[in-house]
């Protein structure tokens, strides 16, 4: 069993990548002189107690920076979030805490990371680039939900 | 106001079963886990099990697999708990609980006032 | 499986300090088990302390506080009052289920 997170880096379709700007998640072009994030992934290890099928529940964090991803409702609405988290306290909770997991499935390289908490909303980035990233329920219009992970070993 | 509302006292015969009820209103119990536990008298507490009332996913103590069936119904916001095979053992008061992680851990923050069994020919 | 044992009574004073213990007979009380506290007061009336060891539940007054202390996991009253008389529970988890221990009555006179 991994009981350490494993890092990757990401970017999208358009070869966009995640750069944290004031204490924000955006996807913006590779450029030189640019520090993407490295993320940090672990599997949940209550597997077991959440829905099969789904794809892998993952906790998602900031490799090195104490930063984890979560969902939470603001008004109806649910969001992506950066919270001040230690990935493996999460990873070592009695229960799956739903609002940082998500669920990660593969389909050859692409990627996708839906929220446990709100399920049906996925990890976004806008097609316009230089956003934020969101949650959305809208797959394939006019935000981009597939991304491609690349493990660091 | 967050409360936990649980179904009335139980007089019931052995080797029959029981469906108890746990009404939450003020959450939406799809969001949290709902815990419950057994108190017979003068004795401490015993965790039966949980259910994730959003996947309807379970977790039992051993003791209590065969014996406890928890299932939610997420329309009413209310878990259940049902027992089988009644026997006077199983005379206790049932508490459900929420269980519900804030800021950095678990807590038990709101508990029913329990629901009596009893058990007797 | 574990047996999670607690003092059966204490008795103490309003201002005074006072710990409640709870033991493992797995072996020593870490921070992976999540210690819970919980209270008990007359008619059924249960309130969540602490959670995690050492964190208090949302609204519990700052006079209760979780640690570990040796091998056991503690809940500190400091400066109990009358109305912290109770009986309290501890729960602690042992991979995927939660045992909790028989109580402590606490007696503030």
């Known amino acids: 069993k991994i009981d350490t997170p494993q890092r990757g880096s990401i970017q999208d379709i358009n070869h966009r990548v995640w750069v944290l700007q004031d204490q924000t998640l955006i996807a913006v072009p590779r450029k030189d002189r640019m520090s993407p994030v490295t993320i940090a992934l672990i599997s949940c290890r209550h597997v077991e107690t959440l829905e099969k099928d789904r794809g892998n529940p993952i906790y998602l964090g900031l490799n090195g920076l104490n930063l984890c991803l979560m969902c939470a409702k603001v008004g109806d609405q649910p969001t992506l979030q950066l919270k001040e988290k230690d990935i493996m306290d999460l990873y070592n909770q009695p229960e799956p805490v739903k609002s940082f997991l998500f669920y990660h499935s593969q389909s050859g390289r692409n990627s996708t990371f839906e929220s446990v908490a709100f399920p049906g909303w996925f990890i976004a980035v806008s097609s316009e680039g230089g956003c934020p990233l969101i949650l959305t329920q809208e797959l394939g219009k006019a935000n981009t939900t597939d991304f491609g992970l690349t493990m660091l070993f | 106001e967050v409360q936990l509302q649980q179904s009335g006292a139980e007089l019931v015969k052995p080797g029959a079963s029981v469906k108890l009820s746990c009404t939450a209103s003020g959450f939406n119990i799809k969001d949290t886990y709902i815990y419950w536990v057994k108190q017979r008298p003068e004795q401490g507490l015993e965790w039966i099990g949980r259910?994730?009332?959003?996947?309807?996913?379970?977790r039992y103590d051993p003791k209590f697999q065969g014996k406890a069936t928890l299932t939610a119904d997420t329309s009413s916001n209310t878990a259940f708990l049902q027992l089988s095979s009644l026997t006077s053992e199983d005379t206790a008061v049932y508490y459900c609980a929420r269980y519900d992680y804030s800021g950095s851990s678990f807590y038990f923050d709101y508990w029913g006032r329990g629901t009596t069994l009893t058990v007797s020919s | 499986q574990a047996v999670v044992t607690q003092e059966s009574a204490l008795t103490t004073s309003p201002g005074e300090t006072v710990t409640l213990t709870c033991r493992s007979s797995t072996g020593a009380v870490t921070t992976s088990n999540y210690a819970n506290w919980v209270q008990e007061k007359p008619d059924h009336l249960f309130t969540g302390l602490i959670g995690?060891?050492?964190n208090r539940a949302p609204g519990v007054p700052a006079r209760f506080s979780g640690s570990l202390i040796g091998d056991k996991a503690a809940l500190t009253i400091t400066g109990a009052q009358t109305e912290d008389e109770a009986i309290y529970f501890c729960a602690l988890w042992y991979s995927n289920h939660l045992v909790f221990g028989g109580g402590t009555k606490l007696t503030v006179l």
């Open positions: 259910i994730d009332p959003a996947i309807g996913t379970t």
């Open positions: 995690g060891t050492n």
